[in-house]
Protein backbone atom coordinates (compact mmCIF):
# COMPACT_ATOMS: atom_id res chain seq x y z
CA UNK A 1 0.00 0.00 0.00
CA UNK A 2 1.47 3.35 -1.04
CA UNK A 3 0.47 6.76 0.26
CA UNK A 4 -1.07 9.48 -1.88
CA UNK A 5 -1.97 13.10 -1.17
CA UNK A 6 -5.65 14.04 -1.11
CA UNK A 7 -6.80 17.66 -0.88
CA UNK A 8 -10.24 18.94 0.09
CA UNK A 9 -11.60 22.27 1.39
CA UNK A 10 -11.41 22.90 5.10
CA UNK A 11 -14.94 24.25 5.52
CA UNK A 12 -18.21 24.10 3.56
CA UNK A 13 -21.60 25.49 4.53
CA UNK A 14 -24.59 23.43 3.46
CA UNK A 15 -27.38 25.20 1.62
CA UNK A 16 -30.74 25.91 3.23
CA UNK A 17 -31.99 22.79 1.44
CA UNK A 18 -29.43 20.63 3.20
CA UNK A 19 -27.08 20.20 0.24
CA UNK A 20 -23.30 20.45 0.52
CA UNK A 21 -20.81 20.15 -2.32
CA UNK A 22 -17.04 19.98 -2.27
CA UNK A 23 -14.13 18.90 -4.45
CA UNK A 24 -11.80 16.09 -3.48
CA UNK A 25 -8.54 16.16 -5.44
CA UNK A 26 -5.93 13.44 -5.40
CA UNK A 27 -2.33 13.49 -6.63
CA UNK A 28 -2.29 10.40 -8.79
CA UNK A 29 1.23 9.03 -9.18
CA UNK A 30 0.25 7.20 -12.36
CA UNK A 31 -2.68 6.63 -14.69
CA UNK A 32 -5.25 4.80 -12.62
CA UNK A 33 -8.11 3.21 -14.55
CA UNK A 34 -10.15 2.23 -11.51
CA UNK A 35 -10.64 4.58 -8.57
CA UNK A 36 -12.70 4.13 -5.42
CA UNK A 37 -13.86 7.20 -3.51
CA UNK A 38 -15.30 6.92 0.00
CA UNK A 39 -16.74 9.72 2.12
CA UNK A 40 -16.31 9.20 5.86
CA UNK A 41 -17.92 11.26 8.62
CA UNK A 42 -16.04 11.87 11.82
CA UNK A 43 -18.01 13.10 14.80
CA UNK A 44 -17.30 12.59 18.51
CA UNK A 45 -14.24 10.46 17.61
CA UNK A 46 -16.47 8.00 15.74
CA UNK A 47 -15.94 7.43 12.04
CA UNK A 48 -18.79 6.18 9.83
CA UNK A 49 -18.99 5.60 6.08
CA UNK A 50 -21.37 8.02 4.37
CA UNK A 51 -21.07 6.71 0.82
CA UNK A 52 -18.67 5.12 -1.63
CA UNK A 53 -18.33 4.71 -5.38
CA UNK A 54 -15.95 2.99 -7.78
CA UNK A 55 -15.49 4.70 -11.12
CA UNK A 56 -13.52 4.08 -14.26
CA UNK A 57 -13.25 6.06 -17.49
CA UNK A 58 -16.55 7.92 -17.29
CA UNK A 59 -17.25 11.17 -15.48
CA UNK A 60 -20.25 10.07 -13.44
CA UNK A 61 -19.91 8.36 -10.09
CA UNK A 62 -22.56 5.72 -9.42
CA UNK A 63 -23.53 5.24 -5.78
CA UNK A 64 -25.67 2.61 -4.12
CA UNK A 65 -29.41 3.17 -4.28
CA UNK A 66 -29.92 4.46 -0.73
CA UNK A 67 -26.93 6.80 -0.92
CA UNK A 68 -27.22 10.49 -0.04
CA UNK A 69 -24.27 11.25 -2.33
CA UNK A 70 -23.93 12.05 -5.99
CA UNK A 71 -20.77 12.95 -7.83
CA UNK A 72 -18.83 13.50 -11.00
CA UNK A 73 -15.15 13.17 -11.82
CA UNK A 74 -12.79 15.10 -14.03
CA UNK A 75 -9.18 14.02 -14.20
CA UNK A 76 -7.91 13.75 -10.63
CA UNK A 77 -10.82 15.72 -9.19
CA UNK A 78 -14.02 14.34 -7.78
CA UNK A 79 -16.96 16.69 -7.27
CA UNK A 80 -19.07 15.34 -4.43
CA UNK A 81 -22.53 16.42 -3.37
CA UNK A 82 -24.17 15.26 -0.16
CA UNK A 83 -27.92 15.77 0.12
CA UNK A 84 -30.55 15.60 2.85
CA UNK A 85 -28.30 17.08 5.53
CA UNK A 86 -29.69 18.41 8.82
CA UNK A 87 -28.09 20.31 11.69
CA UNK A 88 -27.33 17.06 13.49
CA UNK A 89 -25.22 15.98 10.47
CA UNK A 90 -22.72 18.78 11.05
CA UNK A 91 -19.28 17.21 11.23
CA UNK A 92 -15.99 16.46 9.54
CA UNK A 93 -16.41 14.71 6.17
CA UNK A 94 -13.26 12.94 5.06
CA UNK A 95 -12.48 11.99 1.47
CA UNK A 96 -10.68 8.67 1.06
CA UNK A 97 -9.33 7.77 -2.38
CA UNK A 98 -8.03 4.36 -3.43
CA UNK A 99 -6.37 3.62 -6.75
CA UNK A 100 -7.60 0.08 -7.29
CA UNK A 101 -6.07 -0.69 -10.68
CA UNK A 102 -3.50 -1.06 -12.07
CA UNK A 103 -1.10 -2.05 -9.27
CA UNK A 104 0.40 -0.82 -7.09
CA UNK A 105 -2.49 0.04 -4.80
CA UNK A 106 -2.46 3.63 -3.56
CA UNK A 107 -4.42 5.02 -0.63
CA UNK A 108 -4.98 8.66 0.22
CA UNK A 109 -7.03 10.23 2.98
CA UNK A 110 -7.84 13.92 3.09
CA UNK A 111 -7.81 16.08 6.20
CA UNK A 112 -11.56 16.41 6.02
CA UNK A 113 -14.09 19.11 5.21
CA UNK A 114 -16.02 20.52 8.13
CA UNK A 115 -19.60 20.75 6.88
CA UNK A 116 -21.88 23.05 8.82
CA UNK A 117 -25.59 22.49 8.48
CA UNK A 118 -28.12 24.95 9.83
CA UNK A 119 -31.74 23.84 9.85
CA UNK A 120 -33.94 26.53 8.26
CA UNK A 121 -36.23 28.47 10.57
CA UNK A 122 -39.86 27.46 10.11
CA UNK A 123 -41.89 30.12 8.32
CA UNK A 124 -44.09 32.09 10.73
CA UNK A 125 -47.83 31.64 10.23
CA UNK A 126 -49.23 34.29 7.98
CA UNK A 127 -52.60 36.01 8.35
CA UNK A 128 -52.68 36.89 4.66
Amino acid sequence: CKAMHVAQPAVVLASSRGIASFVCEYASPGKATEVRVTVLRQADSQVTEVCAATYMMGNELTFLDDSICTGTSSGNQVNLTIQGLRAMDTGLYICKVELMYPPPYYLGIGNGTQIYVIDPEPCPDSDF
Partner: antibody
Framework: VQLVQSGAEVVKPGASVKVSCKAS?????SYWINWIRQAPGQGLEW???????????YYNEMFTGRVTLTRDTSTSTAYMELSSLRSEDTAVYYC????????WDQGTMVTVSS | DIQLTQSPSFLSASVGDRVTITCSAS?????IHWFQQKPGKAPKLLIY???TLASGVPSRFSGSGSGTEYTLTISSLQPEDFATYYC?????????FGQGTKLEIK
Protein backbone atom coordinates in the same frame (compact mmCIF):
# COMPACT_ATOMS: atom_id res chain seq x y z
CA VAL B 1 -13.33 -1.84 -30.64
CA GLN B 2 -15.25 -5.08 -30.78
CA LEU B 3 -17.22 -7.24 -28.36
CA VAL B 4 -18.05 -10.77 -29.47
CA GLN B 5 -20.44 -12.95 -27.49
CA SER B 6 -20.95 -16.71 -27.46
CA GLY B 7 -23.74 -18.32 -29.44
CA ALA B 8 -27.41 -18.90 -28.72
CA GLU B 9 -28.37 -21.31 -25.95
CA VAL B 10 -31.45 -23.45 -25.27
CA VAL B 11 -31.57 -24.58 -21.65
CA LYS B 12 -34.01 -26.33 -19.37
CA PRO B 13 -35.74 -24.67 -16.39
CA GLY B 14 -33.61 -24.92 -13.26
CA ALA B 15 -30.37 -25.17 -15.21
CA SER B 16 -27.60 -22.57 -15.58
CA VAL B 17 -26.17 -20.74 -18.56
CA LYS B 18 -22.79 -19.06 -18.98
CA VAL B 19 -22.41 -16.42 -21.69
CA SER B 20 -19.02 -15.08 -22.73
CA CYS B 21 -18.05 -11.66 -24.12
CA LYS B 22 -14.63 -11.35 -25.75
CA ALA B 23 -13.26 -7.83 -26.07
CA SER B 24 -10.70 -6.57 -28.54
CA UNK B 25 -9.37 -3.29 -29.90
CA UNK B 26 -8.95 -1.53 -26.56
CA UNK B 27 -7.42 -1.99 -23.10
CA UNK B 28 -9.77 -4.51 -21.50
CA UNK B 29 -8.98 -3.47 -17.92
CA SER B 30 -9.81 0.21 -18.49
CA TYR B 31 -13.58 -0.07 -18.96
CA TRP B 32 -16.50 -1.68 -17.19
CA ILE B 33 -18.19 -4.61 -18.86
CA ASN B 34 -21.94 -4.28 -18.35
CA TRP B 35 -24.53 -7.00 -18.87
CA ILE B 36 -28.04 -6.14 -20.02
CA ARG B 37 -30.93 -8.31 -21.08
CA GLN B 38 -34.02 -7.80 -23.21
CA ALA B 39 -36.95 -10.19 -23.15
CA PRO B 40 -38.86 -10.59 -26.44
CA GLY B 41 -40.79 -7.39 -27.18
CA GLN B 42 -39.70 -5.83 -23.89
CA GLY B 43 -37.36 -3.10 -22.71
CA LEU B 44 -33.78 -3.14 -21.45
CA GLU B 45 -32.86 -4.46 -18.01
CA TRP B 46 -29.40 -3.97 -16.46
CA UNK B 47 -28.04 -7.13 -14.82
CA UNK B 48 -24.71 -5.95 -13.46
CA UNK B 49 -21.17 -4.85 -14.26
CA UNK B 50 -17.60 -5.91 -13.63
CA UNK B 51 -14.38 -3.90 -13.51
CA UNK B 52 -12.04 -6.24 -15.39
CA UNK B 53 -8.88 -5.07 -13.63
CA UNK B 54 -9.77 -5.67 -10.01
CA UNK B 55 -12.83 -7.85 -10.54
CA UNK B 56 -15.07 -5.42 -8.63
CA UNK B 57 -18.71 -6.24 -9.35
CA TYR B 58 -22.07 -4.53 -8.95
CA TYR B 59 -25.31 -6.44 -9.39
CA ASN B 60 -28.94 -5.56 -9.85
CA GLU B 61 -30.51 -6.89 -6.64
CA MET B 62 -33.23 -8.48 -8.75
CA PHE B 63 -30.60 -11.05 -9.79
CA THR B 64 -28.71 -11.38 -6.51
CA GLY B 65 -27.80 -14.96 -5.77
CA ARG B 66 -28.54 -16.09 -9.32
CA VAL B 67 -25.98 -14.19 -11.36
CA THR B 68 -22.20 -14.27 -11.23
CA LEU B 69 -19.93 -12.00 -13.26
CA THR B 70 -16.33 -13.03 -13.82
CA ARG B 71 -13.51 -12.17 -16.19
CA ASP B 72 -10.29 -13.60 -17.59
CA THR B 73 -7.84 -10.78 -18.26
CA SER B 74 -5.45 -13.10 -20.11
CA THR B 75 -8.05 -13.58 -22.86
CA SER B 76 -9.89 -10.23 -22.41
CA THR B 77 -13.11 -12.14 -21.87
CA ALA B 78 -15.97 -11.42 -19.47
CA TYR B 79 -18.53 -14.01 -18.40
CA MET B 80 -22.08 -13.86 -17.11
CA GLU B 81 -23.51 -16.97 -15.46
CA LEU B 82 -27.19 -17.11 -14.57
CA SER B 83 -28.52 -20.03 -12.54
CA SER B 84 -31.91 -21.44 -11.53
CA LEU B 85 -33.27 -20.44 -14.91
CA ARG B 86 -36.99 -20.01 -15.47
CA SER B 87 -39.06 -19.25 -18.54
CA GLU B 88 -39.05 -15.51 -17.72
CA ASP B 89 -35.28 -15.51 -18.23
CA THR B 90 -35.77 -16.12 -21.95
CA ALA B 91 -34.14 -13.04 -23.48
CA VAL B 92 -31.31 -11.63 -25.52
CA TYR B 93 -28.33 -11.02 -23.23
CA TYR B 94 -25.96 -8.21 -24.21
CA CYS B 95 -22.56 -7.11 -22.99
CA UNK B 96 -21.71 -3.43 -23.36
CA UNK B 97 -18.51 -1.53 -22.71
CA UNK B 98 -17.75 1.14 -20.19
CA UNK B 99 -19.55 3.85 -18.30
CA UNK B 100 -21.14 5.02 -21.52
CA UNK B 101 -22.27 1.66 -22.94
CA UNK B 102 -20.65 2.88 -26.13
CA UNK B 103 -20.05 -0.51 -27.75
CA TRP B 104 -22.42 -3.50 -27.68
CA ASP B 105 -22.32 -6.96 -29.16
CA GLN B 106 -25.34 -8.20 -31.10
CA GLY B 107 -26.32 -10.29 -28.09
CA THR B 108 -26.83 -13.92 -27.14
CA MET B 109 -30.31 -15.39 -27.29
CA VAL B 110 -31.00 -17.60 -24.27
CA THR B 111 -34.18 -19.67 -24.46
CA VAL B 112 -35.41 -21.42 -21.33
CA SER B 113 -37.72 -24.24 -22.32
CA SER B 114 -38.54 -27.74 -21.14
CA ASP C 1 -34.43 2.03 -7.47
CA ILE C 2 -34.77 5.12 -9.65
CA GLN C 3 -37.71 4.72 -12.02
CA LEU C 4 -37.53 6.37 -15.42
CA THR C 5 -40.81 7.04 -17.19
CA GLN C 6 -40.75 7.96 -20.86
CA SER C 7 -43.55 9.72 -22.63
CA PRO C 8 -45.06 9.05 -24.96
CA SER C 9 -44.64 5.27 -25.19
CA PHE C 10 -45.64 5.39 -28.86
CA LEU C 11 -45.25 8.25 -31.27
CA SER C 12 -46.37 8.50 -34.89
CA ALA C 13 -44.66 11.18 -36.94
CA SER C 14 -43.70 12.05 -40.49
CA VAL C 15 -40.34 12.66 -42.15
CA GLY C 16 -39.34 16.27 -41.50
CA ASP C 17 -41.28 16.55 -38.24
CA ARG C 18 -39.75 17.84 -35.03
CA VAL C 19 -40.32 15.37 -32.20
CA THR C 20 -39.62 15.46 -28.49
CA ILE C 21 -39.45 12.51 -26.09
CA THR C 22 -39.42 13.13 -22.35
CA CYS C 23 -37.87 11.08 -19.57
CA SER C 24 -38.99 11.68 -15.98
CA ALA C 25 -36.95 10.29 -13.08
CA SER C 26 -38.49 9.32 -9.75
CA UNK C 27 -35.53 11.02 -8.04
CA UNK C 28 -33.04 13.66 -9.13
CA UNK C 29 -30.21 12.27 -11.28
CA UNK C 30 -26.89 13.76 -12.39
CA UNK C 31 -27.32 12.94 -16.06
CA ILE C 32 -29.55 11.09 -18.48
CA HIS C 33 -28.25 9.10 -21.44
CA TRP C 34 -30.17 8.11 -24.58
CA PHE C 35 -30.05 5.00 -26.77
CA GLN C 36 -31.61 4.15 -30.12
CA GLN C 37 -32.58 0.60 -30.99
CA LYS C 38 -33.75 -0.79 -34.30
CA PRO C 39 -35.53 -4.18 -34.61
CA GLY C 40 -33.17 -7.13 -34.28
CA LYS C 41 -30.20 -4.90 -33.45
CA ALA C 42 -28.33 -3.97 -30.30
CA PRO C 43 -29.02 -0.55 -28.78
CA LYS C 44 -26.76 2.28 -29.95
CA LEU C 45 -25.52 5.10 -27.75
CA LEU C 46 -27.02 8.36 -29.01
CA ILE C 47 -26.49 11.00 -26.33
CA TYR C 48 -24.53 10.80 -23.09
CA UNK C 49 -24.26 13.13 -20.09
CA UNK C 50 -27.67 14.64 -20.96
CA UNK C 51 -26.58 16.64 -23.99
CA THR C 52 -23.35 15.31 -25.54
CA LEU C 53 -23.77 13.59 -28.89
CA ALA C 54 -22.02 10.26 -29.26
CA SER C 55 -19.53 9.86 -32.09
CA GLY C 56 -21.17 9.85 -35.51
CA VAL C 57 -24.61 10.94 -34.30
CA PRO C 58 -26.19 13.62 -36.53
CA SER C 59 -26.71 17.10 -35.12
CA ARG C 60 -30.49 16.89 -35.58
CA PHE C 61 -30.47 14.97 -32.28
CA SER C 62 -30.21 16.98 -29.09
CA GLY C 63 -30.73 16.40 -25.39
CA SER C 64 -31.45 18.66 -22.46
CA GLY C 65 -32.79 18.71 -18.92
CA SER C 66 -31.74 18.52 -15.29
CA GLY C 67 -32.92 17.12 -12.00
CA THR C 68 -35.86 14.85 -12.78
CA GLU C 69 -36.98 16.07 -16.22
CA TYR C 70 -35.08 15.38 -19.44
CA THR C 71 -35.85 15.54 -23.14
CA LEU C 72 -34.56 14.11 -26.39
CA THR C 73 -35.39 16.17 -29.48
CA ILE C 74 -35.06 15.27 -33.14
CA SER C 75 -35.29 18.51 -35.09
CA SER C 76 -36.20 17.06 -38.48
CA LEU C 77 -37.05 13.37 -38.67
CA GLN C 78 -35.26 11.28 -41.25
CA PRO C 79 -36.39 7.83 -42.45
CA GLU C 80 -33.57 6.15 -40.52
CA ASP C 81 -34.72 7.70 -37.23
CA PHE C 82 -37.78 5.47 -36.90
CA ALA C 83 -36.78 3.21 -34.01
CA THR C 84 -37.25 2.73 -30.27
CA TYR C 85 -35.54 5.19 -27.92
CA TYR C 86 -34.52 4.50 -24.32
CA CYS C 87 -33.29 6.84 -21.60
CA UNK C 88 -30.94 5.58 -18.90
CA UNK C 89 -29.63 6.80 -15.54
CA UNK C 90 -26.29 5.93 -13.97
CA UNK C 91 -26.50 8.04 -10.82
CA UNK C 92 -27.35 5.15 -8.50
CA UNK C 93 -27.35 1.38 -8.63
CA UNK C 94 -29.12 -0.43 -10.08
CA UNK C 95 -28.67 1.34 -13.40
CA UNK C 96 -32.11 1.70 -14.95
CA PHE C 97 -33.67 2.34 -18.35
CA GLY C 98 -36.95 3.93 -19.32
CA GLN C 99 -39.61 1.64 -20.78
CA GLY C 100 -38.88 2.94 -24.26
CA THR C 101 -40.57 5.16 -26.84
CA LYS C 102 -41.40 3.59 -30.17
CA LEU C 103 -41.24 6.13 -32.97
CA GLU C 104 -43.29 5.03 -35.98
CA ILE C 105 -43.95 6.45 -39.44
CA LYS C 106 -47.33 8.15 -39.71
Amino acid sequence: VQLVQSGAEVVKPGASVKVSCKASGYTFTSYWINWIRQAPGQGLEWIGRIAPGSGTTYYNEMFTGRVTLTRDTSTSTAYMELSSLRSEDTAVYYCARGDYFDYWDQGTMVTVSS
Amino acid sequence: DIQLTQSPSFLSASVGDRVTITCSASKSVSYIHWFQQKPGKAPKLLIYDTSTLASGVPSRFSGSGSGTEYTLTISSLQPEDFATYYCQQRTTYPLTFGQGTKLEIK
